[in-house]
Interface confidence: low
Amino acid sequence: YDFTNCDFEKIKAAYLSTISKDLITYMSGTKSTEFNNTVSCSNRPHCLTEIQSLTFNPTAGCASLAKEMFAMKTKAALAIWCPGYSETQINATQAMKKARKSKVTTNKCLEQVSQLQGLWRRFNRPLLKQQGSSDYKDDDDKHHHHHH
């Protein structure tokens, strides 16, 4: 799916209002410095591509994220604000239903969600090049100032 035509501001609002909090809840008890961010994205559609992949594609050592609250809300946001997204996810949904029902929070999953938090931050803070400025617009957690 090509995320070019999503309503990014609506997705951003969904993230700020609920998804971000669900990610924090999932990571509760984990130090923010515990994992290094190794996954990055260069623009909003690219960020959503990476977010979708990390959220819904099972990986070695972490097969159960799709059932988490933040994942379900992410899926809902993409389905609502990305034209045609729902249709492309029919097969993926069938596969998700076959996934293990038990939620096991492995260290690998925690690392993956830490990467997701970084991707979402990048998605929500595009550079605003106005009058020579290249500072990030800080809409969510103010203490992060990663320049890419």
Epitope: D2, E9, S42, L127
Partner: antibody, heavy 121, light 105 residues
Framework: EVQLVQSGAEVKKPGASVKVSCKAS????????MNWVRQAPGQRLEWMGI????????SYNQKFKGRVTLTVDKSASTAYMELSSLRSEDTAVYYC??????????????WGQGTTVTVSS | EIVLTQSPATLSLSPGERATLSCRAS?????MHWYQQKPGQAPRPWIY???NLASGVPARFSGSGSGTSYTLTISRLEPEDFAVYYC????????FGGGTKVEIK
């Protein structure tokens, strides 16, 4: 410095096709989207479509769907717009315009110089 | 498709006067961009994301609005400001308004 250099003017007969190129330089080609916009004489700007050089994904203005094809050659940092089944009302200046997602709202921050396409029998 | 309607189509004013250009969307959009175009030239980005001036645009220009109603304002017209201004949205694909020509009275 970001530059978009388009191919030269074209004169075509009705029913023919035209392929306009847009050579990008001064930035990483696959990091930005490329729009195609046209402007008939004395008329408004009309968005035709957009392509992601990163993955080749496209989205078209329904008005042109089936007639316009957007492609890229990543190795040459060049975007192409092909318009088929030309008619006289396709006479216009065709622009490529880079779309920079670093601005909220994804604005077209750099434009090519324009390619004049004249359709006449 | 979101339709953008600009008004007036032509604005005849003298240098030093205030210019107010309107852009209305057929349904709500997140942001509006504005471009300036002079005869024989490609459009130039003028105002990004409703209210952010593009590099080199003088401070006499400002942008505002939300939802379906957006405005570009020139506080005091200078000779170089006479041109056509287009609004553009991206919330649903991309569309341009019909343009407002600011001409010397």
């Amino acid at each position: 410095e970001v530059q978009l250099v388009q191919s030269g003017a074209e004169v075509k007969k009705p029913g023919a096709s035209v392929k306009v190129s847009c050579k990008a330089s001064g930035y990483t080609f696959t990091d930005d989207y490329m729009n195609w916009v046209r402007q008939a004489p004395g008329q408004r700007l009309e968005w035709m479509g957009i392509i992601s050089p990163y993955n080749g994904g496209t989205s078209y203005n329904q008005k042109f769907k089936g007639r316009v094809t957007l492609t890229v050659d990543k190795s040459a940092s060049t975007a192409y717009m092909e318009l088929s089944s030309l008619r006289s009302e396709d006479t216009a200046v065709y622009y490529c315009a880079r779309e920079d997602y670093d601005y909220d709202g994804y604005a077209m921050d750099h434009w090519g110089q324009g390619t004049t396409v004249t359709v006449s029998s | 498709e979101i339709v953008l309607t600009q008004s007036p189509a032509t604005l005849s004013l003298s240098p030093g006067e205030r210019a107010t250009l309107s852009c209305r969307a057929s349904s709500s959009v997140s942001y509006m961009h504005w471009y300036q175009q002079k005869p024989g030239q490609a459009p130039r980005p003028w105002i990004y994301a409703t209210s952010n001036l593009a590099s080199g645009v003088p401070a006499r220009f400002s942008g505002s609005g939300s939802g379906t109603s957006y405005t570009l304002t020139i506080s005091r017209l200078e000779p170089e400001d006479f041109a056509v201004y287009y609004c553009q949205q991206w919330s649903s694909n991309r569309t341009f308004g019909g343009g407002t020509k600011v001409e010397i009275k």
